[in-house]
């Protein structure tokens, strides 16, 4: 399992992971105590047939070519959590691991 | 976690799981001994903002709106394996659980 890594200077048109820092402060999300920003990354690019396909299923659907199937798209295939400190709806401070906050790898699915 | 289920008569335009039977025999994939066909399903439909979003990350990327991020797409969010009997490249018969062969749920990511 592997995926491409790109940056803002890359000329890669295929599905790739790009750096992105999410800034909660800039969003006005004041209920998040920490972190105020974190490296989230995101996926972007084209999914040509077979390139970076995560699942055999993606290839099979392409073969079967059913009505309305749009072909694979560039999406996170591996994600990881981050620890966060935040206020919940009852104004209690919660410290917890929030799943799927960071994109570690991108692929076509 | 939930996802929509549709069929060929559905008028649903949003991200939905549709039935699809994959027929290995029709593909000429004769190295697969069994099953000769199975119910794979596939995802299709539109991903309006927030609808069926699997990860908070998807929402955050939409907020941050980086260059080239195409918005979420309708993709498998839950998959399951099937048991298969097949020949490997060394012409040995292998019996094993092949992951991510069936789409159980679709969502926007």
């Amino acid at each position: 399992d592997f995926g491409l890594d790109c940056d803002e200077h890359s000329t890669e048109s295929r599905c790739c992971r790009y750096p992105l820092t999410v800034d909660f402060e800039a969003f006005g999300w004041d209920w998040i105590i920490a972190p105020k920003r974190y490296k989230a990354n995101y996926c972007s690019g084209e999914c040509e047939f077979v390139f970076l396909q995560k699942y055999p299923h993606t290839h099979l659907v392409h073969q079967a070519n059913p009505r309305g199937s749009a072909g694979p798209c560039c999406t996170p295939t591996k994600m990881s959590p981050i620890n966060m400190l935040y206020f919940n709806g009852k104004e209690q401070i919660i410290y917890g691991k929030i799943p799927a906050m960071v994109v570690d790898r991108c692929g076509c699915s | 976690d939930f996802g929509l289920d549709c069929d060929e008569h559905s008028t649903e335009s949003r991200c939905c799981r549709y039935p699809l039977t994959v027929d290995f025999e029709a593909f000429g994939w004769d190295w697969i001994i069994a099953p000769k066909r199975y119910k794979a399903n596939y995802c299709s439909g539109e991903c309006e903002f927030v609808f069926l979003q699997k990860y908070p990350h998807t929402h955050l990327v939409h907020q941050a709106n980086p260059r080239g991020s195409a918005g979420p797409c309708c993709t498998p969010t839950k998959m399951s394996p099937i048991n298969m009997l097949y020949f490997n490249g060394k012409e040995q018969i292998i019996y094993g659980k092949i992951p991510a062969m069936v789409v159980d749920r679709c969502g926007c990511s």
């Epitope: - | 004769d30 697969i32 001994i33 000769k36 020949f87 012409e91």
Partner: antibody
């Protein structure tokens, strides 16, 4: 529908070879194991071996291994069973049979279709 | 090799009777047992697979049961067309082995 049509009866001398054919129709020939089973006059059934036409991988009963060869011609969807060094006790009806998988386990199958049989008589 | 012992080797019965044929394996065959019917001059015909599953198109008067080493074929109400020879087959391991057959005759 699935059909297995075998070649006609043969009379052979001891020490000779015989090649029995089994022509398949009504299904994708390359994707199903073909087995060979024989039956001596008034006797029971005896498994000889099988072949997978897609890649020619075969599995023989040890009892026949030195004398039998199973082959296929995918262009004509035909399976062949050749038995060499014939003896009088090889006089039998030889059947081909298709193995059909109802599940995915290695033994999740049964014989769903049989050829009509080919009588091979070995006599001096 | 796994030995399959079928009994009885022959059986006389009347139309309408219920008959049972047994097959004993020399070791556990994990229910990988099939039953066949064979009429004179004809190829065998599959009746039952995986010990108790009926092949499509086979009448429900045929039933199979058993596990481990002991298996039975039951014909609930004999009709004239059921008089034939019946064989069991184990497919749990190679080489495949058949029982020696049970000849079912009209009394």
């Amino acid at each position: 529908q699935v059909q297995l049509v075998q070649s006609g009866a043969e009379v052979k001398k001891p020490g000779a070879s015989v090649k029995v054919s089994c022509k398949a129709s009504g299904y994708s020939f390359t994707g199903y194991f073909m087995h060979w089973v024989r039956q001596a006059p008034g006797q029971g059934l005896e498994w000889m071996g099988n072949i997978y036409p897609y890649n020619g991988v075969s599995n023989y009963n040890q009892r026949f291994k030195a004398r039998v060869t199973m082959t296929t011609d995918t262009s004509t969807s035909t399976a062949y069973m050749e038995l060499r060094s014939l003896r009088s006790d090889d006089t039998a009806v030889y059947y081909c049979a298709r193995r059909y998988y109802y599940g995915t386990g290695p033994a999740d199958w049964y014989f769903d279709n049989w050829g009509q049989g080919t009588l091979v008589t070995v006599s001096s | 090799d796994i030995q399959m012992t079928q009994s009885p080797s022959s059986l006389s019965a009347s139309v309408g009777d219920r008959v049972t044929i047994t097959c004993k394996a020399s070791q556990d065959i994990n229910s990988y047992l099939s039953w066949f019917q064979q009429k004179p001059g004809k190829a065998p015909k599959s009746l039952i697979y995986r010990a108790n599953r009926l092949v499509d198109g086979v009448p429900s008067k045929f039933s199979g049961s058993g596990s481990g080493t002991d298996y039975t074929l039951t014909i609930s109400s004999l009709q004239p067309e059921d008089f034939a020879t019946y064989y069991c087959l184990q497919s749990d391991e190679f080489p495949l082995t058949f029982g020696q057959g049970t000849k079912l005759e009209i009394k």
